[in-house]
């Protein structure tokens, strides 16, 4: 693939209700199981068909889970992260980071590999600034007519 692959990074709070068979997804990552180079974060590796996560529809494979019920998932062993989910109770609040590919190919969730991407504000701020400059220039042009 030529050029750079960039990502739009967005965060979302997802509230799941544990179903009859649980939350319905698998995770990878942890300090003892690095899924992404130089990142010991916890990532979604599988969404189970007809599970709570699948029925909710917002959690995607490749998403990074930042916290569970407000508890940070940084620097956890893999099994400790698994246990945190299993003991999270009936109503589970997930803080999730979605990473959408925005260049070199169709938009889609990143599955695995280098997590380096550009945060959404780094894209939106220049776009907003350019829009403001264009609007100002247009107003000046109209005043001169």
């Amino acid at each position: 693939m030529n050029g750079r692959v960039d990502y739009l990074v967005t965060e979302e709070e997802i509230n799941l209700t544990r179903g009859p068979s649980g939350l319905g997804f698998n995770i990878v990552g942890g300090t003892d199981q690095q899924y992404v180079s130089n990142d010991s974060g916890i990532y979604v590796s599988r969404i189970k068909e007809n599970g709570a996560a699948a029925l909710d529809g917002r959690l995607q494979e490749g998403d990074k889970i930042l916290s569970v019920n407000g508890q940070d998932l940084k620097n956890l062993l893999h099994q400790d992260a698994v246990d945190l989910f299993r003991n999270a109770g009936y109503a589970v609040s997930l803080r999730v980071q979605h990473r959408l590919q925005v260049q070199n190919g169709p938009i889609g969730h990143r599955g695995e590999g280098d997590p380096s991407g550009i945060p959404i504000f780094m894209v939106l701020v220049p776009v907003f600034a350019l829009t403001m400059v264009a609007a100002w220039a247009f107003m000046r042009y109209r005043q001169q007519l």
């Epitope: 990878v28 899924y35 599988r46 893999h78 698994v82 989910f85 299993r86």
Partner: nanobody
């Protein structure tokens, strides 16, 4: 996608041993939970053994406990099934299964629905 290729099957006498191998593709093999199932023609898949991503936890069907041992080598992207004291009733096709990552729910290693990827299988015949 993950590809699984089994090998090591064959014909062996009752009481003998065989070692099955399952080679997996993918650079994140060390995150896969792996299992062996077996399937006779016209019958449902039967759970044999499973192993977690690190090899620290193993699970066995009662029918093979004490005779079979599951292990893995993450450097070689391979999971093994050492089968000792083989019986004629162990004659069947052995299939390797995998899933990426650990379930955040109760782990049911004997449930085929826990796994996404399946090999073609290798025939074991005990005479």
């Amino acid at each position: 996608d993950v590809q699984l290729v089994e090998s090591g099957g064959g014909l062996v006498q009752a009481g003998g041993s065989l070692r099955l191998s399952c080679a997996a593709s993918g650079r994140t093999f060390s995150t896969y939970e792996m299992a062996w199932f077996r399937q006779a023609p016209g019958k449902e898949r039967e759970f044999v053994a499973a192993i977690n991503w690190s090899g620290s936890s193993t699970y066995y069907a009662d029918s093979v406990k004490g005779r079979f041992t599951i292990s893995r080598d993450n450097a070689k992207n391979t999971v093994y099934l050492q089968m000792n004291s083989l019986k004629p009733e162990d004659t069947v096709v052995y299939v390797c299964a995998a899933v990426i990552g650990s379930t955040v729910d109760e782990y049911r290693p004997s449930d085929p629905l826990e796994y996404d990827y399946w090999g073609q299988g290798t025939q074991v015949t005990v005479s």
